[in-house]
Interface confidence: medium
Amino acid sequence: MMTGTIETTGNISAEKGGSIILQCHLSSTTAQVTQVNWEQQDQLLAICNADLGWHISPSFKDRVAPGPGLGLTLQSLTVNDTGEYFCIYHTYPDGTYTGRIFLEVLESSVAEHGARFQIP
């Protein structure tokens, strides 16, 4: 019986060009985490395997960094990074737990709108 729950950072926003940490936490279960997958829609971003360590998908290796912990750091954000991200916890013996994070990447307020906030 699956008793655990996934806590996530929920809906988050960040500025274009910046970085963001995606974080999930599995609680209320004694199941052993064997692997965590990080996915965006149907794309695999990274995995953290308990025995084999981290693997970042080749197409994301320049902009994705492992950690902190089982989390994932996205760098050099673009507006195309806006969307749903999923942390998929493979556990034994419970099975699979999935958490959802929605990331909105905003145009930089300084770069795009800085002039209108200047003090005369």
Partner: nanobody, 124 residues
Framework: EVQLVESGGGLVQPGGSLRLSCAAS????????MGWFRQAPGKEREFVAA?????????SYADSVKGRFTISADNSKNTAYLQMNSLKPEDTAVYYC????????????????WGQGTLVTVSS
């Protein structure tokens, strides 16, 4: 739906080599690892090796084959390979390819597709 077809099995003398192939039909999107397992007559199926499908940088081997077997994946051909060197009579078994969600200490967790198997016989 993904289907797996193994090939490359056969009869080989002790100390010889074989290369097994596992061709996947269909698009592998959710699989993280491709794994090889084997089942000897009268024994349970056991883990042999696994490789991450995207990138190939993570590999795992059973202690009994470390240093003798090498697993790899060619995404462009949708095929995983098992290069078996220094074969021993105790390597005789039907070898199965499997699509895995997880590799590591819990090899049998998260497996959702099996091939039909290919027989490897090591005998003089």
């Amino acid at each position: 739906e993904v289907q797996l077809v193994e090939s490359g099995g056969g009869l080989v003398q002790p100390g010889g080599s074989l290369r097994l192939s596992c061709a996947a039909s269909g698009t592998i999107t959710s699989a993280v690892f491709m794994g090889w397992f084997r089942q000897a007559p009268g024994k349970e199926r056991e883990f042999v090796a696994a490789v991450i499908w995207r990138g190939g940088s993570l590999k795992s081997y059973a202690d009994s084959v470390k240093g003798r077997f090498t697993i790899s994946a060619d995404n462009s051909k949708n095929t995983a390979y098992l290069q078996m060197n220094s074969l021993k009579p105790e390597d005789t078994a039907v070898y199965y390819c499997a699509k895995l969600a997880v590799a590591g200490n819990y090899y049998y967790y998260g497996m959702d597709v099996w091939g039909q198997g290919t027989l490897v016989t090591v005998s003089s």
